[in-house]
Interface confidence: medium
């Protein structure tokens, strides 16, 4: 018996070939001996089977002795043994129809689980293997689960169903709803305007939801909601914004926030959450702000940074075009009785300067100037 695998919703063509290369009498039946279709001369006749409207043949092939059964919009329950009767002989074809569907939706939030469920006919024992867009292979039986979806899991998943040494391939497009970056860090001198951007890693026709930016300032004991907003068809509207600091938000995607000025009391970490309509859970992006201040008070030149800096970052004070006077893996450095000239405060990571602030030290009878 020949075995053919089909995909739910697809069209399958079961072949039946006579030894004579001419149009002769044939008919297709199912395992219950109910006639599906056949011919009467050059006419196609259909029987009372449940396939009725979905069954067809190719009249153009009859003259060559080929009498195929075409079944459109396959259903799992179409799985059966189909019998072609022609020239006093019977050809049997076993059709097994499989379906593979994602648990709820193909648009899933980062961190959520993807469950693929295989629909299969009774009595079958298929195995499934899926390959993710990043090349990860997952094997399973009737259900296949991937926990903690990542951004790289967005794209086409290719799943192969194996049964009786035959295989059928499914392609499922999965969209992982996430921000392009899980975390970002902004370095600013005190007083500078700060731009935060939260680009999404996906595009959809309509995007509706609501979001909020919570901020944990380094100096504060608790976090504070800085802004709440709504998203309707990719249009952003601010619902509420704190009075201090007063963030401004762009009206279009990507989500864009402007902090009027970087201040030590704002330095810290924020968490932007976005709840999308008809989705359980939220998208998250962490954003960090590091603020630098260089000051001269009496005979002490000080450079400080506030915010989440890693222990490997180096803070240095140096006179322009000279070696660093002081460099420490700390959040404050100072020089007593600094020489007159343009001093630079540098925050660097493995030699790469992340933030720089200049302060002009005048001869002792003058007051300092900050450019």
């Amino acid at each position: 018996k020949k075995v053919v695998l089909g995909k739910k919703g697809d069209t399958v063509e079961l072949t039946c070939t006579a030894s004579q290369k001419k149009s002769i009498q044939f008919h297709w039946k199912n395992s219950n001996q109910i006639k599906i279709l056949g011919n009467q001369g050059s006419f196609l006749t259909k029987g009372p089977s449940k396939l009725n409207d979905r069954a067809d043949s190719r009249r153009s092939l009859w003259d060559q002795g080929n009498f195929p059964l075409i079944i459109k919009n396959l259903k799992i329950e179409d799985s059966d043994t189909y019998i072609c009767e022609v020239e006093d002989q019977k050809e049997e074809v076993q059709l097994l129809v499989f379906g593979l569907t994602a648990n709820s939706d193909t648009h899933l939030l980062q961190g959520q689980s993807l469950t693929l469920t295989l629909e299969s006919p009774p009595g079958s024992s298929p195995s499934v293997q899926c390959r993710s867009p990043r090349g990860k292979n997952i094997q399973g039986g009737k259900t296949l689960s991937v926990s903690q979806l990542e951004l790289q899991d967005s794209g086409t998943w290719t799943c192969t169903v194996l049964q009786n040494q035959k295989k059928v391939e499914f392609k499922i497009d999965i969209v992982v709803l996430a921000f392009q970056k899980a975390s970002s860090i902004v370095y600013k001198k005190e007083g500078e305007q700060v731009e935060f951007s939260f680009p999404l890693a996906f595009t959809v026709e309509k995007l509706t939801g609501s979001g909020e930016l919570w901020w944990q300032a380094e100096r504060a004991s608790s976090s504070k909601s800085w802004i709440t907003f709504d998203l309707k068809n990719k249009e952003v509207s601010v619902k509420r914004v704190t009075q201090d600091p007063k963030l401004q938000m762009g009206k279009k995607l990507p989500l864009h926030l402007t902090l009027p000025q970087a201040l030590p009391q704002y330095a810290g970490s924020g968490n932007l959450t976005l709840a999308l309509e008809a989705k359980t859970g939220k998208l998250h992006q962490e954003v960090n702000l590091v603020v630098m201040r260089a000051t001269q008070l009496q005979k002490n030149l000080t450079c400080e940074v506030w915010g989440p800096t890693s222990p490997k970052l180096m803070l240095s004070l140096k006179l322009e075009n000279k070696e660093a006077k002081v460099s420490k893996r700390e959040k404050a450095v100072w020089v007593l009785n600094p020489e007159a000239g343009m001093w630079q405060c540098l925050l660097s990571d493995s030699g790469q300067v992340l933030l720089e602030s200049n302060i002009k030290v005048l001869p002792t009878w003058s007051t300092p100037v900050q450019p």
Epitope: E190, Q193, R240, K246
Partner: antibody, heavy 118, light 111 residues
Amino acid sequence: QVQLVQSGAEVKKPGASVKVSCKASGYTFTDYVIHWVRQATGQGLEWIGEIYPGSGSAYSNSKFKDRVTITADKSTNTAYMELRSLRSDDTAVYFCARRGNGTGFAYWGQGTLVTVSS
Amino acid sequence: DIVLTQSPASLAVSLGQRATITCKAGQSVDYDGDSYMNWYQQKPGQPPKLLIYVASNLESGIPARFSGSGSGTDFTLNIHPVEENDAATYYCQQSYKDPLTFGQGTKLEIK
């Protein structure tokens, strides 16, 4: 201690402009927002707008949007509020103010009386 | 804009008694457990003086005779016991949403 000292009284003709100053002392000027509020004689208080002195970002009440400009000079720790196309109903005392640790205005300037009269 | 309506417009209270001023906001000024309502006292020829912030927090240096309460849209300033020095105009102000707005004021007279 925190102090906000404003410029003196002004008399202006309708259609003219006025620029009121507010000099801050006793704290780091760039650390706090300066707000401007006005009060017509015997009337209530009306918020005009605000400025972040560090970056110069300013926001104002849409009622004054086209006529008001709020600026700050970090070198002199001074904030300015300029109101153009003056009308007689702009006659009021103009205050600058700063927040305390909470959300209210804990520090106020002494006020500047602006009289608009032909 | 959020409209704040104070009542009464004026009131006269005997020395040592309680003065109660209410402020009704056109929409809720609550967020995340806090009510963004402040109260000020103003005497003629002087700038306003902050008494209460975030509905019920007493500004430093303000006597405990002053207290604030309320949430959502309804707020109250209580002064008890009233002293002669309390004669002034009192304003509520919301710092929930731009533009910041003030109530029209309540004039307190001491009998």
